[in-house]
Interface confidence: low
């Protein structure tokens, strides 16, 4: 089966790479605009230049195109703790990231929030903090992992999952209580 192509894809596929079909005259292939520019006017005829204009400040195109407008530059989301890694240029969008010792938590494909990497206090680093993943901690004896923080077993309630990890400590506490009630 031949995959269904959208109208624009169909039109583009008629022309060689780097060119697109004239929207008013399908016998003409116009040269696409370079990245950093956009289409101002289609080429008037075969072998004639496409009228491409440079993107204005605050906009960009990152690849060759025949867009009628440049794309607006992204803004780093301060409320998400994001910082600007590199500013927007005519041919590249803003690059946003996190500060040192922080990782990105993605809420969706395009939305991330910056959080401080866990320090693994009362534990050891099992896996170091990475760009998109928090540190993975292993807790010392007498501590259990809760939201990537090593918490004392004295805070472990019987209803929680930590009872398995803190079982020896809980039994010891029980034992001392029992021995005092003879």
């Amino acid at each position: 089966l031949v995959p269904h192509l959208g109208d624009r894809e169909k039109r583009d596929s008629v022309c060689p790479q780097g060119k697109y079909i004239h929207p008013q005259n399908n016998s003409i292939c116009c040269t696409k605009c370079h990245k950093g520019t956009y289409l101002y006017n289609d080429c008037p005829g075969p072998g004639q230049d496409t009228d491409c204009r440079e993107c204005e400040s605050g906009s960009f195109t990152a690849s060759e195109n025949h867009l009628r407008h440049c794309l607006s530059c992204s803004k780093c989301r301060k409320e998400m703790g994001q910082v600007e890694i590199s500013s927007c240029t005519v041919d590249r969008d803003t690059v946003c990231g996190c500060r040192k010792n922080q990782y990105r938590h993605y809420w969706s494909e395009n939305l991330f929030q910056c959080f401080n990497c866990s320090l693994c206090l009362n534990g050891t680093v099992h896996l170091s903090c990475q760009e998109k993943q928090n540190t993975v901690c292993t807790c010392h004896a007498g501590f259990f992992l809760r939201e990537n923080e090593c918490v004392s077993c004295s805070n472990c309630k019987k209803s929680l999952e930590c009872t398995k990890l803190c079982l020896p400590q809980i039994e010891n506490v029980k034992g001392t209580e029992d021995s005092g009630t003879t």
């Epitope: 409320e79 809420w107 929030q113 401080n116 990497c117 866990s118 928090n134 939201e147 990537n148």
Partner: nanobody
Framework: EVQLLESGGGLVQPGGSLRLSCAAS????????MGWVRQAPGKGLEWVSQ????????YYDHSVKGRFTISRDNSKNTLYLQMNSLRAEDTAVYYC????????????WGQGTLVTVSS
Amino acid sequence: EVQLLESGGGLVQPGGSLRLSCAASGFTFVKYSMGWVRQAPGKGLEWVSQIADTADRTYYDHSVKGRFTISRDNSKNTLYLQMNSLRAEDTAVYYCAIYTGRWVPFEYWGQGTLVTVSS
């Protein structure tokens, strides 16, 4: 002790409205950006909306933009989420949360309030 208490959830018909509230205590409310996160049955957490500490900047997920409005009353230590034009896919437990920038996405949580959109 940090406490977040959500209220205002319930059963509503598609196209209807609800207003969620979150009463906060145990921390300096005015210092923190606050948010709403939801969890639909059998699904993961989904970020819904966030509001800056000073309430001058609000942010929404594309799925709720134009329908939901986040606000806060710093004098009452309360966060709100006005939900209009509700859809079946908005059915979830809604949690109010504080963004502290620490270890996990939203460090403190309320117990959540269930919103069910059904005819």
